[in-house]
Amino acid sequence: DAEFRHDSGYEVHHQKLVFFAEDVGSNKGAIIGLMVGGVVIA
C-alpha cells in the first residue's frame, strides 16, 4: 500500500499587504490584507 504523507515538501508563504482606504473610497486609514500562496484572503 502507498503511504500518503501530509508533508509534501512545499512551503506556503504568507505576506501582509497594506492598502490605503482612500484609494478606493473616501475613508481614511489602512486596510490590512493577507496573501497566502499568491491569493489575497483577508
Partner: nanobody, 124 residues
Framework: EVQLVESGGGLVQPGGSLRLSCAAS????????MGWFRQSPGKEREFVAT????????YYADSVKGRFTISRDSAKNAVYMQMNSLKPEDTAVYYC?????????????????WGQGTQVTVSS
C-alpha cells in the same frame, strides 16, 4: 513617473533625531502614495513608513512606530520623515519611493519610482 531626491541623512548618536526630506519633481505628485524604505548591508530593503496621496492616512512598520513620523507637503512636492529616539539598528540607507493608487504600500516591488537614497548612521 516622478523623480525623487532624498536629503537629511547623516551621523547621529543613539537617542538623537534626524529629519529626512524627499523632493519630488513632476506635476502628478498628488497621484502617488509615498513611502520610506531602508536597506542595511546584507539585508533586503524593508518598509519603514508610508503616507497616502492626501496626507490623511499613514502606516508604519512596528519597529519605528511611535518614533518616526511621516508627512508630506503637496505645495512643495515634498515628503518628510522625522526620526526620533534613533537606535543603532536604524542604521541604513533610507529611500523615498512613489506608488500609484491601489498599490500595496508596504511592498517595495509595488513602488515604481525610487530616489538614490540617503545614509543614516546611528553610532556613538
Amino acid at each position: 513617473e516622478v523623480q525623487l531626491v532624498e536629503s537629511g541623512g547623516g551621523l547621529v548618536q543613539p537617542g538623537g533625531s534626524l529629519r529626512l526630506s524627499c523632493a519630488a519633481s513632476g506635476r502628478t505628485f498628488t497621484s502617488y502614495n509615498m513611502g520610506w524604505f531602508r536597506q542595511s548591508p546584507g539585508k533586503e530593503r524593508e518598509f519603514v513608513a508610508t503616507i497616502s496621496r492626501s496626507g490623511g492616512s499613514t502606516y508604519y512598520a512596528d519597529s519605528v512606530k511611535g518614533r518616526f513620523t511621516i508627512s508630506r507637503d503637496s505645495a512643495k512636492n515634498a515628503v518628510y520623515m522625522q526620526m526620533n529616539s534613533l537606535k543603532p539598528e536604524d542604521t541604513a540607507v533610507y529611500y523615498c519611493a512613489a506608488a500609484r493608487i491601489g498599490a500595496a504600500v508596504n511592498i517595495p516591488s509595488e513602488y515604481g519610482s525610487w530616489g538614490q537614497g540617503t545614509q543614516v548612521t546611528v553610532s556613538s
